[in-house]
C-alpha cells in the first residue's frame, strides 16, 4: 500500500514539474482604461488530456445503451471555451456590470483579468493594480481591523470611510472590543452577511486601479445590499474603475456599461438605455412571455420548456436545423460584432435541467402532513454550488432533432413507469404536432413536450396504453447523426462524483 501511495505522489510531482512555467503578466502602470479584445479562454490542458484518455479507453470496449461508459462515447468537449470572443472597454472611473445566469462565465471573466485563467486568443489591457472580492467571503484568524487592513498601511480616514460604506459600524459597535474583536479560531463567529461585508471592506480598503467585485451581495438582504451598493460601489468608489458581477436589474441601471454573458459568449454589451431599446426582444428573451401570469403552474412549466427550446416547434413547416435564428442581441457600439453561434442557434446551445422527485427534501418549508400526490416536475432551483448536492441532475440534454440516447432512455423509463413504479401518470393523448401555441391548455406537462418532440419525427401517437416494444423502436439510435454536446459543468460534476 505504501508503495502505491509513493508511486501516486511521485506521479503527481512529476506531472507538476512537467507543466509549463507560470508566466507573470506584464502590466503597464500608465494604462488608465480596461480593455478586452476578442478574448477566448479554455480550461487548462489537463482536461483535454483526460478526455483523450477517456475516449481511447471507451473505444476499446463496446458500449450498450444503458452502460455508464456511454458518458464518454459521444462528446465534443475537447475544444469547449469557457469564454468566447469577449469584447469590452471601460474608461477610468467607470462601472461595468457583468450579468448572466449561473455558469455563463462571469467569474471566469474576472479570472482572465487577474491572470488566473490564460486566454488562448485576444488581448487584455489594464494597469495590473487589482483588488478582488470573491463571491465566497473568507475570514482570517485575527481582529476585524486586521481582516480589513490585511497588511496594507493603515489610514484612519480611509478605514473609517470603508467601515461606514460597508455598513459595519453598527456591527462593530455591538462588541465591547469594537473592531479589535478576534474572529476565527478562538474568536467569535460571524453571520454570512457580516463575513460578506468584511470581505468587501477588505477589497475596497486596498488601493487599486481596478476593483473586481464578484457577486459581493449574495448573502446580504435586499435593504443592506441596496445601501451598500449606493454608499460603497457608487459613492465611495466613484472615481475607481469597477467591474461588478451582479444579476440585479437595479445595479445594471446604475452601471456605465453592461456586459451580459450567456454560455461563455457575449449576449449583450452596451449601456442600459441600449439594452432597453432592444424591445421587444428585451422582454421576450430576458423576461419570457408577457401573458405568462394568466397560465396555470403546469402551463408555465410548459412555456418555460418551450422558451428554452426555441426551435422548430414555432412553425408548422419543417425547419432546417442549421438555420440561423433572428439576431436580436448584437453587441452594440465599439465592438459591434455578430453574436456567437451558441446564441444565434439555440439548437447548439445546451440547457441543463434537473428533473427531481418532489419530496420534502427539496421543499424547505412544506408541512409534513401535505397530502399532495407525488409528481415529477421541472426543478427551477438555480444551479448553485451550495445547493447542488441535493439536486440529482440529468447529465446532458441535447436540443437537436434526434434526442440523445440518455435522454431517450430516461423518457422511456418515465413513460413505462420503470423509474417509479408507484407513480400513476395520467396523460392525455398527444397527437403529432409541430406547433406549441401559447394559448392556455389544460394539464400540459413536460411529458407532453417530450411526447411532441418524439412524435415530431415518428408520427407515433402516444396514448395511455403504451406498447413498450413499439416505444423502444422509436428510441432507436443512429449514433452518427446525434450531435455530441455537453457542458463543462456536467463534465466537472461527473469527475467530482466519480473521482477515485
Amino acid at each position: 500500500q505504501t508503495w502505491y501511495d509513493s508511486l501516486g505522489a511521485i506521479n503527481k510531482i512529476q506531472d507538476f514539474l512537467q507543466k509549463q512555467e507560470y508566466k507573470t503578466l506584464e502590466y503597464n502602470l500608465t494604462t488608465t482604461e480596461v480593455v478586452m479584445e476578442n478574448v477566448t479562454a479554455f480550461w487548462e490542458e489537463g482536461f483535454g488530456e483526460l478526455f483523450e484518455k477517456a475516449k481511447q479507453n471507451n473505444n476499446n470496449r463496446k458500449t450498450s445503451n444503458g452502460d455508464d461508459s456511454l458518458f464518454f462515447s459521444n462528446f465534443s468537449l475537447l475544444g469547449t471555451p469557457v469564454l468566447k470572443d469577449i469584447n469590452f472597454k471601460i474608461e477610468r472611473g467607470q462601472l461595468l456590470a457583468v450579468a448572466g445566469s449561473t455558469g455563463a462565465g462571469k467569474t471566469s471573466l474576472l479570472m482572465v483579468i487577474m491572470g488566473e485563467l490564460e486566454p488562448s486568443e485576444g488581448k487584455i489591457k489594464h494597469s495590473g493594480r487589482i483588488s478582488f472580492c470573491s463571491q465566497f467571503s473568507w475570514i482570517m484568524p485575527g481582529t476585524i481591523k486586521e481582516n480589513i487592513i490585511f497588511g496594507v498601511s493603515y489610514d484612519e480616514y480611509r478605514y473609517r470611510s470603508v467601515i461606514k460604506a460597508c455598513q459595519l459600524e453598527e456591527d462593530i459597535s455591538k462588541f465591547a472590543e469594537k473592531d479589535n474583536i478576534v474572529l476565527g479560531e478562538g474568536g467569535i463567529t460571524l453571520s454570512g452577511g457580516q463575513r460578506a461585508r468584511i470581505s468587501l471592506a477588505r477589497a475596497v480598503y486596498k488601493d487599486a486601479d481596478l476593483y473586481l467585485l464578484d457577486s459581493p451581495f449574495g448573502y446580504l438582504d435586499v435593504l443592506t445590499e441596496k445601501e451598500i451598493f449606493e454608499s460603497c460601489v457608487c459613492k465611495l468608489m466613484a472615481n475607481k474603475t469597477r467591474i461588478l458581477v451582479t444579476s440585479k436589474m437595479e445595479h445594471l441601471k446604475k452601471a456605465d456599461k453592461i456586459l451580459i454573458l450567456h454560455e461563455g459568449s457575449s449576449y449583450f454589451y452596451g449601456t442600459f438605455s441600449e439594452l432597453q431599446n432592444l424591445q421587444p426582444d428585451f422582454s421576450s428573451k430576458l423576461m419570457g412571455c408577457d401573458s405568462f401570469d394568466q397560465f396555470s403552474a403546469e402551463r408555465r412549466n410548459s412555456i418555460l420548456t418551450e422558451t428554452l427550446h426555441r426551435f422548430s416547434l414555432e412553425g408548422d413547416a419543417p425547419v432546417s436545423w442549421t438555420e440561423t435564428k433572428k439576431q436580436s442581441f448584437k453587441q452594440t457600439g465599439e465592438f459591434g460584432e455578430k453574436r456567437k453561434n451558441s446564441i444565434l442557434n439555440p439548437i447548439n446551445s445546451i440547457r441543463k435541467f434537473s428533473i427531481v422527485q418532489k419530496t420534502p427534501l427539496q421543499m424547505n418549508g412544506i408541512e409534513e402532513d401535505s397530502d399532495e400526490p407525488l409528481e415529477r416536475r421541472l426543478s427551477l432551483v438555480p444551479d448553485s454550488e451550495q445547493g447542488e448536492a441535493i439536486l440529482p441532475r440529468i447529465s446532458v440534454i441535447s436540443t437537436g432533432p434526434t434526442l440523445q440516447a440518455r435522454r431517450r432512455q430516461s423518457v422511456l423509463n418515465l413513460m413505462t413507469h420503470s423509474v417509479n413504479q408507484g407513480q400513476n401518470i395520467h396523460r392525455k393523448t398527444t397527437a403529432s404536432t409541430r406547433k406549441v401555441s401559447l394559448a392556455p391548455q389544460a394539464n400540459l406537462t413536460e411529458l407532453d413536450i417530450y411526447s411532441r418532440r418524439l412524435s415530431q419525427e415518428t408520427g407515433l401517437e402516444i396514448s395511455e396504453e403504451i406498447n413498450e416494444e413499439d416505444l423502444k423502436e422509436c428510441f432507436f439510435d443512429d449514433m452518427e447523426s446525434i450531435p455530441a454536446v455537453t457542458t463543462w459543468n456536467t463534465y466537472l460534476r461527473y469527475i467530482t462524483v466519480h473521482k477515485s
Epitope: G100, A104, V222, K248, I260, K285, N364
Partner: nanobody, 121 residues
Framework: VAYLQESGGGLVQAGGSLRLACVAS????????MGWYRQAPGKQRELVAF???????NYADSVKGRFTISRDNAKNTVFLRMISLKPEDTAVYYC???????????????WGQGTQVTVSS
Amino acid sequence: VAYLQESGGGLVQAGGSLRLACVASGNIFTINNMGWYRQAPGKQRELVAFITSAGITNYADSVKGRFTISRDNAKNTVFLRMISLKPEDTAVYYCHQAVVHGPIGLEYDYWGQGTQVTVSS
C-alpha cells in the same frame, strides 16, 4: 412581471404564534433570495429574515430563535413561522422575492403589499 401575495397576518396575544406565507405568481423563471421585512409605525423598514436559493438563512438579532424562514421552490412560496411573539413584533410584514424572468438570469426585486401583525399584551 411578478406579483406577491402575503397571507397569515392577524391579531395574536403575546407568546402566541403565527405563520406567514407569501406566494409569487406571474412570469417566473426562478427565484433567488426570498425574505421577510417589517415596518413598525414611525420606523424604517427592517430585515426580519431572508433565505438564499441555496437555503442559507439569515435572521435579525431580535428574532433569532423565535422565527423560522423556509421556502417551497416548486410553489414559489416563502414562509415565516413566528413563535413566542412579543408586542414589539407588531408591524406590517412585507415579503420580498428576487425574481428571474428568463434564462439570461437578470434579477428583479418584487415586494408584497404587506400583512399586518399585531401582538397584544
